[in-house]
Interface confidence: low
């Protein structure tokens, strides 16, 4: 799916109002410095491509994110603010259901969601110059992490 026609401001609003909080809830009990951000994105469409991939595509060690609250809200945001997105996801969703295993929060899933948090923050600051993983440690990160 080509994310270039999405209503980025609306998706950003959905992230700030709900998705970010659900990501934090999922990561509760995990230190913000525990995982290094190895996935990045260069612009908003690219960020959404990466976000979709990490959220909905089962990966080795983490096949259970698609039913998490943040994932369902991400799907809703993309379905409404990206014209034509929902049609492209019907077959993908069916395949995902077959591949999904029991809902278990593994360390690999926590790492994957940590990467998602980084991608979402990049999505919200698309004009930020890339400086490797350090640009995920900005002042506003305190709004997105629990420190335990």
């Amino acid at each position: 799916y080509d994310f270039t026609n999405c209503d980025f401001e609306k998706i950003k609003a959905a992230y700030l109002s709900t998705i970010s909080k659900d990501l934090i809830t999922y990561m509760s009990g995990t230190k913000s410095t525990e995982f290094n951000n190895t996935v990045s994105c260069s612009n908003r469409p690219h960020c959404l491509t990466e976000i979709q991939s990490l959220t909905f595509n089962p990966t080795a060690g983490c096949a259970s994110l698609a039913k998490e609250m943040f994932a369902m809200k991400t799907k809703a945001a993309l379905a409404i603010w990206c014209p034509g997105y929902s049609e492209t996801q019907i077959n993908a969703t069916q395949a995902m259901k077959k591949a999904r295993k029991s809902k278990v929060t593994t360390n690999k899933c926590l790492e994957q969601v940590s990467q998602l948090q980084g991608l979402w923050r990049r999505f919200n600051r698309p004009l930020l110059k890339q400086q490797g993983s350090s640009d995920y440690k900005d002042d506003d990160d305190k709004h997105h992490h629990h420190h335990h």
């Epitope: 026609n5 999405c6 209503d7 401001e9 609306k10 959905a14 709900t18 369902m72 809200k73 799907k75 809703a76 379905a79 409404i80 603010w81 990206c82 014209p83 034509g84 929902s86 049609e87 996801q89 019907i90 969703t93 069916q94 259901k97």
Partner: antibody
Framework: EVQLQQSGPVLVKPGASVKMSCKAS????????MNWVKQSHGKSLEWIGI????????SYNQKFKGKATLTVDKSSSTAYMELNSLTSEDSAVYYC??????????????WGQGTSVTVSS | QIVLSQSPAILSASPGEKVTMTCRAS?????MHWYQQKPGSSPKPWIY???NLASGVPARFSGSGSGTSYSLTISRVEAEDAATYYC????????FGGGTKLEIK
């Protein structure tokens, strides 16, 4: 107060086209999507499609692709739906409905009063 | 496209009775909305996202369900509840159920 004011009833001949309007007020027009829904006499609701006044992006029910065209005029906060090649099957009441994010789900929270379209020779 | 099937098509109840109508989806959906429509009027949002009552909806209404099966229940039916109720999903585009017409005896 959110209001959606739809254009009046129309009587058209088979094969003709019709363009109906839905004027929005009481909220920022570009903040929410606009749905169009068909209701034939005594029948259920049928979703036609959705448009984003923000970027003009549309998504259609496969059944109505080629039949309905959704557009908006941001300057007048008005959504339009054009139906072409009309037949008696298109005789129905057509609603516009604003869609907003509420309670973890996008719902059609405000509806227009409906535009009645009668196709008859 | 996800198909929503509502049952029963017509439901007849006496005032004070408890009634339940169901909505089944052809594949799993995240949430279900419900709308009420009376003859000659536009549909009104009635229950948001499976279980949240819209503004002004009496507390005798409730909604529940998950996956492919959802329901709307009225604990004690009143005459003013006579209407057609439609379920609607948005997980994959948007579709409505065929409606359940509630008649009061």
């Amino acid at each position: 107060e959110v209001q959606l004011q739809q254009s009046g009833p129309v009587l058209v001949k088979p094969g003709a086209s019709v363009k109906m309007s839905c004027k929005a007020s009481g909220y920022t027009f570009t903040d929410d999507y606009m749905n169009w829904v068909k209701q034939s006499h005594g029948k259920s609701l049928e979703w036609i499609g959705i448009i984003s006044p923000y970027n003009g992006g549309t998504s259609y029910n496969q059944k109505f692709k080629g039949k309905a065209t959704l557009t908006v005029d941001k300057s007048s906060s008005t959504a339009y739906m054009e139906l072409n090649s009309l037949t008696s099957e298109d005789s129905a009441v057509y609603y516009c409905a604003r869609e907003d994010y509420d309670y973890d789900g996008y719902a059609m929270d405000h509806w227009g009063q409906g535009t009645s379209v009668t196709v008859s020779s | 496209q996800i198909v929503l099937s509502q049952s029963p098509a017509i439901l007849s109840a006496s005032p004070g009775e408890k009634v339940t109508m169901t909505c089944r989806a052809s594949s799993s959906v995240s949430y279900m909305h419900w709308y009420q429509q009376k003859p000659g009027s536009s549909p009104k949002p009635w229950i948001y996202a499976t279980s949240n009552l819209a503004s002004g909806v009496p507390a005798r209404f409730s909604g529940s369900g998950s996956g492919t099966s959802y329901s709307l229940t009225i604990s004690r039916v009143e005459a003013e509840d006579a209407a057609t109720y439609y379920c609607q999903q948005w997980s994959s585009n948007r579709t409505f159920g065929g409606g359940t017409k509630l008649e009061i005896k």
